[in-house]
């Protein structure tokens, strides 16, 4: 049995079922249109 609040995640996806979005750190904001 385990109850945890975990720690902040900062990794990108690693396995097919990691459930993580890519979240690339080098992405830049670009205004649409």
């Amino acid at each position: 049995s385990e109850t945890t609040t975990g720690t902040s995640s900062n990794s990108s996806q690693s396995t097919s079922n990691s459930g993580l979005a890519p979240n690339p750190t080098n992405a830049t904001t670009k205004a649409a249109g």
Epitope: T4, G6, N17, S18, A21, P22
Partner: antibody
Framework: DVQLKESGPALVKPTQTLTLTCTVT?????????WHWIRQPPGKALEWMGY???????RYNPSLKTRLTISRDTSKNQFVLTMTNMDPVDTATYFC??????????WGQGTTVTVSS | DIVMTQSPLSLPVTPGEPASISCRSS????????????LTWYLQKPGQSPQLLIS???TRASGVPDRFSGSGSGTDFTLKISRVEAEDVGVYYC?????????FGGGTKLEIK
């Protein structure tokens, strides 16, 4: 089949703490994926709140981070949303969902929470 | 945060006719590492939770009829229904599943004329 079901109080008072539980059947929350909370104010769009990954790591929406904790009870295959200092603007339907690397593929039915004195 | 903008807000359609919903993101959703667009479509039928329709901009989820199709890349995306049926009514949401915080569009309500 994977199923998720939310449970918790329908009514909370302002300044109180909300605790909602998502019970997952058909898949172990420690085996894979991310496990999310999403909310929807009446007549409005969806807002992503945060997740706990199968590893136990968490991530929160910065707009809610100071008030939010997502934890889990692996013995019951549940993950839990705790939100402090509730306000009437937090009135919404709260959904739990499973996150893949591209989408939310399974959703709970949702539970409506009203914040009122 | 990435802003997702949908249009139109409301879409009245005659059964059997096509329908098209637009979604624009404030930032490109094309991931250079895998050349996939991390754009997802959901349908929320009245009184229900959202259900997954399309992921990676154009990949239909299991059990989704082939009258639904998704297209687009970068910042501009489209969901098309080739022939609308009565069961298609509800609110359609696009979502970026690319960068945290994950964000949704404001929704497009499809109704039958």
């Amino acid at each position: 089949d994977v199923q998720l079901k939310e449970s918790g109080p329908a009514l909370v008072k302002p300044t109180q703490t909300l605790t909602l539980t998502c019970t997952v059947t058909g898949y172990s929350i420690t085996s894979g994926y991310t496990w999310h909370w999403i909310r929807q104010p009446p007549g409005k769009a969806l807002e992503w709140m945060g997740y706990i990954q199968y590893t136990g790591s968490t991530r929160y929406n910065p707009s809610l981070k100071t008030r939010l904790t997502i934890s889990r009870d692996t013995s019951k295959n549940q993950f839990v949303l705790t939100m402090t200092n509730m306000d009437p603007v937090d009135t919404a339907t709260y959904f739990c969902a499973r996150g893949t690397t591209a989408s939310f593929d399974y959703w709970g039915q949702g539970t409506t929470v009203t914040v009122s004195s | 945060d990435i802003v997702m903008t949908q249009s139109p807000l409301s879409l009245p359609v005659t059964p059997g006719e096509p329908a098209s919903i637009s979604c624009r993101s404030s930032q490109s959703l094309l991931y250079s590492s895998d050349q996939k667009n991390y754009l997802t479509w959901y349908l929320q039928k009245p009184g229900q939770s959202p259900q997954l329709l399309i992921s990676w901009a154009s990949t239909r989820a299991s059990g989704v009829p082939d009258r639904f199709s998704g297209s687009g890349s970068g910042t501009d995306f489209t969901l098309k229904i080739s022939r609308v049926e009565a069961e298609d009514v509800g609110v359609y949401y696009c979502q970026q599943y690319f960068i945290y915080p994950l964000t949704f569009g404001g929704g497009t309500k499809l109704e039958i004329k």
